[in-house]
Amino acid sequence: ITQQDLAPQQRVAPQQKRSSPSEGLCPPGHHISEDGRDCISCKYGQDYSTHWNDLLFCLRCTRCDSGEVELSPCTTTRNTVCQCEEGTFREEDSPEMCRKCRTGCPRGMVKVGDCTPWSDIECVHKESGTKHSGEAPAVEETVTSSPGTPASPCSLSG
């Protein structure tokens, strides 16, 4: 599920407040009715919108996957913020999954950066100080590098 999935709302529930659009747009936390005459509030914890918009449906809240922790819940104006669990990280070029951080550096290298939710440990060559891309674990280590569970995109929209 991505934050861009539609959250269908065929009928307006009693708790969903209506107001009039301004300049044809509805405020954050709302979507517009099909005829463009009403702004309908998103449902807290279920869907959201972050900007003034004319979306026909609010955007479905992201659910954090196993392997992720929820930093902040979904509100009507902001998507859920999920973060990889301790010991795992999510790379920018593969945001769909949390991967396990390596437990150590290859032989001849030293650790200069810790595992964070956004990056693997950072290793540099002892002599030259050049960074290592991080694919090959040390020969004597048995570092598991199997990918974690796929993770939903978090709070960014658009």
């Epitope: 861009q4 300049e23 044809g24 972050t50 900007h51 003034w52 004319d54 026909l56």
Partner: nanobody, 126 residues
Framework: EVQLLESGGGLVQPGGSLRLSCAAS????????VGWFRQAPGKGREFVSA????????YYADSVKGRFTISRDNSKNTVYLQMNSLRPEDTAVYYC???????????????????WGQGTLVTVSS
């Protein structure tokens, strides 16, 4: 899920014309307004034009006013961008967008969008 499919890009000489199409596959564009953005090589994404599918109200960036015309055919679930008097500086990847996002209600220029097409390349060169 909202999917936007652009077509009509290509190579054209300065002063020439092209018509881009944006079709919503599936049931909906997901919003009332549909727009076009463009991204020139090495530059950020820039708003070009938008149209309100309900009443046909149109919006244009100053750089394309008088040269580009946006229109819609609701029966075909398609939005068009007619580009005339093309200039080399119009060279860019053109993206169809829906669910346009604005910082304020009175803003005429959206800051982004929820739904994006894959883009179609327009090259203006002699």
């Amino acid at each position: 899920e909202v999917q936007l499919l652009e077509s009509g890009g290509g190579l054209v000489q300065p002063g020439g014309s092209l018509r881009l199409s944006c079709a919503a596959s599936g049931r909906t564009f997901g919003s009332i307004r549909v727009g076009w953005f463009r991204q020139a090589p090495g530059k950020g994404r820039e708003f070009v034009s938008a149209i309100n599918r309900n009443d046909g109200t149109t919006y244009y960036a100053d750089s394309v006013k008088g040269r580009f015309t946006i229109s819609r055919d609701n029966s075909k679930n398609t939005v068009y961008l007619q580009m005339n008097s093309l200039r080399p500086e119009d060279t860019a990847v053109y993206y169809c967008a829906a669910g346009l996002q604005y910082n304020r209600a009175a803003d005429r220029v959206p800051v982004g969008a929820v739904y994006w097409g894959q883009g179609t390349l327009v090259t203006v060169s002699s």
